[in-house]
Interface confidence: medium
């Protein structure tokens, strides 16, 4: 009874196509597969950013795999061949591991990289990123931003920089077609005549950094003697009504403050016969059905009503 053995995949490598963190892991079939011609060989691939405690594990029949990584750190990966039990009369056979690593050789000391990177996708329409200069850098240092997402054939450089003190400290992005619900990769690197500058890499999804416009057209109607209905409209723009969640701040007679969260554009409030004046503001955010995270809009303009006036209107009606 000879022991069945299989070789690891050949030429296992991590390839950087220049997409700022979206890397290709690729390999060739193992040597001496002739004995297993009737067999579909599988590969178990494990990979992670160096420093991460957990490996991502994939089992595939392909000779390549693609995923996003944090290029601020190194990447390690390992792969072995799997012969399914159907090919080996009963037990799965695994080869030894083939291993590969990849990292970008860092230029400059960590302090020189940009600080406080902040990106906001205003109203799901306009992306703006800003940063603060690194530390220990001269004001002759200039920073450049590059970005990529699936759908672009190469990484693009920002064409509309925001400048302060003669330095690029932000980027206004052009219209980004079909860019949400996928990883968006950014690299900010720098150049200086006096010292090398460390690059920084960032990855996020645009729908998770949306800051909507505030709601508009706040109205107030008295439904019954002690019930008031607050209404508002969704802000103009591409965000559908089903994607909003709202926070309302209500003041009764400049004292009672109620803050509540609602999922549609109305809120019914119970008042007492003591209530004289009612004021409210609303702000909006993209809800959990459309994103994993979001940024609250600014508050709407404050609207106030005298309860007596509302009551008169209701009685007239």
């Amino acid at each position: 009874d000879t022991e069945i053995k299989v070789n690891p995949p050949q030429d296992f490598e991590i390839v950087d196509p220049g997409y700022l963190g979206y890397l290709y892991l690729q390999w060739q079939p193992p040597l001496s597969l002739d004995n297993f011609k009737e067999c579909t060989v599988e590969y178990e691939l494990k990979y992670r950013n160096i420093g991460s405690e957990t490996w991502t594990t994939i089992i595939t029949k392909n000779l390549h795999y693609k995923d996003g990584f944090d290029l601020n750190k190194g990447i390690e990966a390992k792969i072995h061949t799997l012969l399914p039990w159907q090919c080996t009369n009963g037990s799965e056979v695994q080869s030894s591991w083939a291993e590969a690593t990849y990292w970008i050789s860092p230029q400059g000391i960590p302090e020189t990289k940009v600080q406080d990177m902040d990106c906001v996708y205003y109203n799901w329409q306009y992306l703006l990123c800003s940063w603060k200069p690194g530390i220990g850098v001269l004001l002759d240092t200039n920073y450049n931003l590059f970005y990529w997402y699936e759908g672009l054939d190469r990484a693009l450089q920002c064409v509309d920089y925001i400048k302060v003190d003669g330095q690029n400290i932000g980027c206004r992005f052009p219209y980004l077609e079909s860019s949400d619900y996928k990883d968006f990769y950014i690299c900010v690197n720098g150049s200086s005549e006096t010292k090398p500058i460390r690059s920084s890499y960032f990855t996020f999804q645009l729908q998770n950094i949306v800051k909507p416009l505030p709601p508009v057209c706040l109205t107030c109607t008295q439904e019954s003697l002690y019930e008031i209905k607050l209404k508002w409209s969704i802000p103009l723009g591409p965000i559908p009504a089903r994607c909003f969640v709202y926070e309302i701040e209500i003041r009764e007679d400049d004292t009672t403050l109620v803050t509540t969260t609602v999922e549609n554009e109305t809120y019914t409030l119970k008042i007492t016969n003591e209530t004289r004046q009612l004021c409210f503001v609303v702000r909006s955010k993209v809800n959990i059905y459309c994103s994993d995270d979001g940024i609250w809009s600014e508050w709407s303009d404050k609207q106030c009503w005298e309860v007596e006036e509302l009551l008169k209107k209701t009685l007239l009606l």
Partner: nanobody
Framework: QVQLQESGGGLVQPGGSLRLSCTAS????????MAWGRQGPGKPRELIAT???????NYAESVKGRFTVSRDNAENTLYLQMNNLKSEDTAVYYC?????????WGQGTQVTVSS
């Protein structure tokens, strides 16, 4: 518009200490990022210490372990404690505040380290 005024500079011997202050005309509570920069004779200006609103600090290699940046939001003041001063620390020291996408600099205060 934020106006900044540095003070505390002067002549000091190598190994000595100085404490620079920077007073802002308005509240600095909402200003996330504040920094100290310096410009030595015949050199471009460089950032040497930063502090954010949470109090996290960062230092240039050349001053790490010797300089300490701090801020007092109630007093609208940024500080730079400089110990074990060296002749290469001779420069005009500037305070920098960056609210949002703007940047404001003070007029600077001269620090001369010489025996």
């Amino acid at each position: 518009q934020v106006q900044l005024q540095e003070s505390g500079g002067g002549l000091v011997q190598p190994g000595g200490s100085l404490r620079l202050s920077c007073t802002a005309s308005g509240s600095i509570r909402g200003i996330g990022y504040m920094a100290w920069g310096r410009q030595g004779p015949g050199k471009p200006r460089e950032l040497i210490a930063t502090i954010n609103s949470a109090g996290d600090t960062n230092y240039a290699e050349s001053v790490k372990g010797r300089f300490t940046v701090s801020r007092d939001n109630a007093e609208n003041t940024l500080y730079l404690q400089m110990n074990n001063l060296k002749s290469e620390d001779t420069a005009v020291y500037y305070c920098n505040a960056r609210p949002g996408l703007q940047s404001y600099w003070g007029q600077g205060t001269q620090v001369t380290v010489s025996s």
